[in-house]
Interface confidence: low
Amino acid sequence: DTEIKVNPPQDFEIVDPGYLGYLYLQWQPPLSLDHFKECTVEYELKYRNIGSETWKTIITKNLHYKDGFDLNKGIEAKIHTLLPWQCTNGSEVQSSWAETTYWISPQGIPETKVQDMDCVYYNWQYLLCSWKPGIGVLLDTNYNLFYWYEGLDHALQCVDYIKADGQNIGCRFPYLEASDYKDFYICVNGSSENKPIRSSYFTFQLQNIVKPLPPVYLTFTRESSCEIKLKWSIPLGPIPARCFDYEIEIREDDTTLVTATVENETYTLKTTNETRQLCFVVRSKVNIYCSDDGIWSEWSDKQCWEGEDLSKKTLLR
């Protein structure tokens, strides 16, 4: 009764197609699979960025897999062949591991790479990224930004740079068709006559860096002798009402400050008959139903009511 053995996959490699972090892991079937012609061989693939504590694990029948990585760090991967128990009249058989690594050899010292990279997707419409030059670079250094997301044939360079003192310090992106809810990859590299410049890689999803416009058309209406309803409207743009959270700041008679977070475009406030003045501002943010994260908008213009008879007034900004 001979022990069943299987070889690891052949030609296991990590291929960089130039998508700034979206890499291909590919391999060939193991040698000597003739005994298992009737059997569907599977592969267990494990991979991670070097320094990460956990491996991602995939079991597949394919000869390739694609995923995004942080190219600021190295990548390591390993794969072995699995023969399901149906093929071996018993327990599952595993080959030894085939292993491979990939990294982009870093150029220049860390101080030369861009600092404080900040990207904001304004109103889910306009992407703008800005950065500061590395703290160890001269004015002859210039930075270039490249980006890619699934749907583009190849990485594209920024065509509309923001400049200061002749250096590129930001990028205004063109309209980015079908670019949300998927990984968006950026590389900022640089060139200098004096020294090599360290590249930086960034990955995010656009819906998580949205900064909406502030709410508009703030109004007051008296609901009862002791209740006032505050209302506002969502700003123009592509963000649907269901995607907003709001934060309200209310000041009564210049003393009490009330803050509240709500999901709708209204807020009911308890007041007393002694209230002489009421002011409020609102700001908005994309909520957890539409993104994992977001940036608060600027505050709206302040809307105030002063006087005796709130019941006769509905104030529009």
Partner: antibody
Framework: QVQLVQSGAEVVKPGASVKVSCKAS????????MNWVRQAPGQGLEWIGR????????HYNQKFKDRVTMTVDTSTSTVYMELSSLRSEDTAVYYC????????????WGQGTLVTVSS | DIQMTQSPSSLSASVGDRVTITCRAS??????????MNWFQQKPGKAPKLLIY???RQGSGDPSRFSGSGSGTDFTLTISSLQPEDFATYFC?????????FGQGTKVEIK
């Protein structure tokens, strides 16, 4: 939190070698350099060299260049410093210290390893 | 090698005093618009602790009473109001050129 844990004290004979380890945790190991600094009893600080935990590149103080070897094991997040042809004046506390880049300083240090060279 | 000279080598001060330690490099430690100068605090039997990097930037979690200044060859560490836990030895260090070099240290003692 960031921790650098060094191997224990060593007593070695003149002419021998010593290998000190520094195990890092609490941060992305390969993003940083590891420096080695020594301090003889009652004396100041002396920089021995550093190793890039990502690429294994080393920069040594010329004073130690022929006697020091720094290595890195990324699988265990450990850096090693080996000093050979030891003499009595190498008796010192040896520290590992993390650094991001030249301008950022050495922001976390190991607890130190006392190496005593004595016959 | 760049030589680092600290002064004074020791000083006595009282809690609440303003303390200034100076460090002079044998050549400029400025490069690319930044000063590659760091300051460390060391207490007996302990590892050094980074206080200031790039001449004036505070290390993480360090009290604001520690500040650094200077450029080129002359640098200063200032403790605005000395606290009991500040009695220690202070070292300057340049990281512009390998080998990185330290000052000989300034011991701050209780008066």
């Amino acid at each position: 939190q960031v921790q650098l844990v060094q191997s224990g004290a060593e007593v070695v004979k003149p002419g021998a070698s010593v290998k000190v380890s520094c195990k890092a945790s609490g941060y992305t190991f390969t993003n940083y350099w590891m420096n080695w600094v020594r301090q003889a009893p009652g004396q100041g600080l002396e920089w021995i060299g550093r190793i890039d935990a990502y690429a294994g590149e080393t920069h040594y103080n010329q004073k130690f260049k022929d006697r020091v070897t720094m290595t890195v094991d990324t699988s265990t997040s450990t850096v090693y410093m080996e000093l050979s042809s030891l003499r009595s004046e190498d008796t010192a506390v040896y520290y590992c210290a993390r650094g991001y880049g030249d301008a950022y300083g050495m922001d976390h240090w190991g607890q130190g390893t006392l190496v005593t060279v004595s016959s | 090698d760049i030589q680092m000279t600290q002064s004074p080598s020791s000083l006595s001060a009282s809690v609440g005093d303003r303390v200034t330690i100076t460090c002079r490099a044998s050549e400029s430690v400025d490069n690319y618009g930044i000063s590659f100068m760091n300051w460390f605090q060391q207490k007996p039997g302990k590892a050094p602790k980074l206080l200031i990097y790039a001449a004036s930037r505070q290390g993480s979690g360090d009290p604001s009473r520690f500040s650094g200044s200077g450029s080129g060859t002359d640098f200063t560490l200032t403790i605005s109001s000395l606290q009991p836990e500040d009695f220690a030895t202070y070292f300057c260090q340049q990281s512009k050129e390998v080998p990185w070099t330290f000052g000989q240290g300034t011991k701050v003692e209780i008066k």
